[in-house]
């Protein structure tokens, strides 16, 4: 018996089509994914194949205005369109708060969206029962599936659950979900879920009867053969884990951003094992039209969009320097107002302990595009913070040794005056350089923001502890020649939209103004 | 649990046709095929042919003539219909599933006067 | 058809031993190779499915490899249990089995 999974993750309310690097579509020819390209190729495989699933291993929400704008209301309408049989919670679904999921999202979907590790307690036990289940058995043809969710437990740290919601180990909480389906004569078992290719190797490995595993969050690319596109494969199509029980898993996940389908036929012998299993992700290129009616529904839903990129967000009564005469080469405000929102995007106080689990930031002065001049009003807009981050890139969480961190900061300024983007903006971090010195040994103090205190102070970098930092995306995959950060980088886990950060930040402060305060010297 | 339950005569004349009945439990044959294979006394295993989930079957060349699978999926069987047998066909007939994973406990059929 | 060349036919060993037992197809069967296990009161058994997977219950003592042609049958420390005659078994076009190999007490 033969099941197709069709199957997407970490799309990150990539709604409607971008270009290839995910960012906003500019030549339409050349662009790529969106729910409307999806549902054709969906269609056309569920038309040529008798047993097809369409699953989403998490993290729908967060991403682009699309998002800021409908907070999860898009997700569960244009996933109903879709017709998907399934998903798993991801971290960013919770990026609003257990209200922002529940309302939008798990009380207007109309397929089952899981997670065994979450438990919820105190009163959100019964207002969110039933909304989101361990399991689902889902008939396919005259055969019956089991599809178990799991999410990332360090969802604590990175989106906002509350404190009614308990993240369990997720090799635990499987184990026993997956023998009471095995009880229900439910042979054949997906482990659905967003803790990253690691632990979805793990869950392959050990929970007893999963048979397949589809995965996210770390945006894992996977191909057979040659790659249609600019990812790099981090090994095959379907990567085969041999389990504690000498059974072969196929652990799958499709890149991110709905630029692929990920692909995957399974084979079932009768008592439910895997005989075979094959695939590759599908590019969603140009190729493939985009479907009339979801494309109408799509620029229906666009017209509120619009509107919102000229709304107040709120004011600023400083000039926000973000002029490449200024972040590429000193401390400058719209660096601090950035590095700042990014912080205070992350504060999560989930430990008497720490004051926060993160204290620092860093912001390559190159990403930062434009000024904002105060002088219109102090009037702060989307459309006026797009232009200073323009690129759709995240604020992520790392976790770096002090060793590395000293390493980017000499990066910082190895060719210092030449008006180049690796020149670093800071929050939590106070940094002194020496020019006169030779490139590789200018940083003559580097203090760090304490995050285990009460009380915030600095403190020298301390080589061989490992830090939390809040970075953008693009220096933590190594870009402006930050190879240290992704070649020793601990732990990365993707944040939220970079714009939504700084917009959030805005509107909760209504009134800004930012100083230069001797965090660079 | 899957199972597969064989039912049929164990002695058989010269010239007459085995019927053996094969009964599937814990899978559905609209999901599944079943095959069949012998094994004569003291030799390795045959196969005789398979009944596929659609309906259809295949047949080993050598018995093609007198071979006979069909299934009524509503009863959850498979017969074997073998007709014209010889003492030579003096086996242990199984039944199995499609991949091989469960098998039916074995007929021993005698063919003989 | 697939032939299925299955060697050796039989082989005596002690309990401790490590028991191993080929096969090899006439063609790439893509490993699509089962190992079966019948005791002497006729019963069969799958032991190992897609070439290398095992089947549920089967102790880990038993492992299976290969690809292509050459299909391998590995019991890393023979139990009395096990004394039983092994067959492999390709489904990559219809069924064709090996010849057996029976395990005997040394």
């Known amino acids: 018996w033969e099941l197709t999974i069709l199957h997407t993750n970490d799309v990150h309310s990539r709604l409607e089509q971008t270009s290839e690097d995910s960012s906003k579509c500019v030549n339409a020819s050349r662009c790529m994914g969106g729910v409307a390209r999806l549902f054709t190729k969906v269609q056309q495989i569920r038309r040529a194949e008798p047993n097809v699933l369409l699953l989403d291993a998490g993290d729908q929400y967060q991403g682009t205005i699309w998002f800021t704008v409908y907070k999860g209301a898009e997700v569960a309408h244009f996933m109903n369109a879709l017709r998907y049989d399934a998903m798993a919670l991801g971290n960013h679904e919770f990026d609003n708060g257990v209200e922002g999921l529940i309302e939008p999202l798990l009380k207007e979907a109309k397929f089952p969206i899981l997670s065994a590790n979450i438990k919820a307690k105190g009163p959100l036990a019964s207002q969110i029962s039933g909304l989101y289940l361990p399991y689902k058995v889902l008939p396919v043809g005259d055969e019956v599936v089991g599809i178990v969710g799991y999410t990332s437990k360090e969802t604590p740290f990175l989106s906002n659950p509350g404190t009614n919601l308990v993240f369990e180990d997720e090799i635990t909480a499987l184990q026993p979900e997956v023998d009471k389906l095995k009880t229900l004569n439910v042979n054949k078992i997906i482990a659905l879920g967003h803790s990253g290719f690691e632990m979805d190797k793990l869950i392959a490995q050990k929970v007893r009867g999963v048979d397949v595993v589809v995965g996210g969050h770390s945006n894992t690319f996977l191909y057979t053969g040659n790659p249609p596109s600019k990812e790099v494969p981090a090994g095959k199509y379907p990567f085969i884990v041999t389990s504690d029980d000498g059974r072969k898993v196929p652990v799958v996940q499709a890149y991110a951003f709905g630029k692929y389908l990920g692909y995957l036929k399974i084979e079932f012998d009768e008592r439910g094992n895997v005989i075979s299993s094959h695939g590759n992700p599908i590019l969603l290129n140009s190729s493939i039209p985009e479907d009339p009616s979801i494309k109408a529904d799509i620029n229906k839903w666009r017209i509120k969009l619009d509107n919102y990129s000229t709304q107040e967000l709120g004011k600023t009564i400083v000039y926000l320097d973000g002029s490449s005469q200024s972040c590429r080469f000193r401390e400058c405000n719209m660096g601090n107002l950035i590095c700042d929102a990014m912080i205070n995007n992350n504060l999560r106080h989930t430990d008497e302990m720490f004051w926060n689990h993160v204290s620092m930031c860093i912001l390559n002065g190159g990403g930062i595009r434009s000024p904002i001049d105060e002088r219109n009003n102090g009037t702060i807009t989307w459309e006026n913070l797009a232009a200073v981050l323009p690129f759709g890139g995240t604020f992520d969480l790392v976790q770096l040794k002090g060793s590395t961190l000293k390493k980017a900061f000499e990066h910082s300024v190895h060719r210092y005056g030449q008006s180049t983007g690796e020149f670093l903006q800071v929050g939590g971090i106070h940094v002194v350089y020496d020019l006169s010195r030779k490139p590789g040994d200018r940083v003559v103090k580097l203090d760090v923001l304490c995050t285990k205190c009460r009380v915030p102070s600095y403190d020298p970098l301390k080589m061989d502890e490992v830090y939390k930092v809040i970075l953008p995306n693009f220096l933590a995959n190594g870009g402006d020649g930050f190879q240290m950060i992704k070649d020793e980088l601990l732990r990365h886990d993707s944040g939220d939209q970079d714009i939504n950060v700084v917009s959030t930040y805005i509107s909760k402060m209504k009134v800004i103004y930012p100083a230069v305060e001797g965090r660079i010297k | 649990e899957v199972t597969l339950k064989q039912s049929g005569p164990g002695l058989v004349k010269p010239t007459e046709t085995l019927t053996l009945t094969c009964t599937v439990s814990g899978f559905s044959l609209s999901s599944y095929g079943i095959q069949w294979v012998r094994q004569p006394p003291g030799k390795g295993l045959e196969w005789l042919g398979v009944?596929?989930?659609?309906?259809?079957?295949d047949y080993n060349a050598a018995f093609i003539s007198r071979l006979t699978i069909s299934k009524d999926t509503s009863k959850s069987q498979v017969v074997l219909t073998m007709t014209n047998m010889d003492p030579v066909d003096t086996a242990t007939y199984y039944c199995?599933?499609?991949?091989?994973?469960?098998w039916g406990q074995g007929t021993l059929v005698t063919v003989s006067s | 058809d697939i032939q299925m060349t299955q060697s050796p036919s039989s082989l005596s060993a002690s309990v401790g031993d490590r028991v191993t037992i080929t096969c090899r197809a006439s063609?790439?069967?893509?490993?699509?190779l089962n190992w079966l296990q019948q005791k002497p009161g006729g019963a069969i058994k799958r032991l190992i499915y897609?070439?290398?997977s095992l089947d549920s219950g089967v102790p880990s003592r038993f492992s299976g490899s290969g690809s292509g042609t050459e299909y391998t049958l590995t019991i890393s420390s023979l139990q009395p249990e096990d004394f039983a005659t092994y067959y492999c078994?390709?489904?990559?076009?219809?069924?064709?089995f090996g010849g057996g190999t029976k395990v005997e007490i040394k």
């Open positions: 897609a070439t290398s």
């Open positions: 063609q790439d069967i893509g490993d699509r």
């Open positions: 078994l390709q489904y990559a076009g219809s069924w064709t």
């Open positions: 199995a599933g499609q991949y091989g994973s469960v």
């Open positions: 009944i596929w989930s659609g309906g259809s079957a």
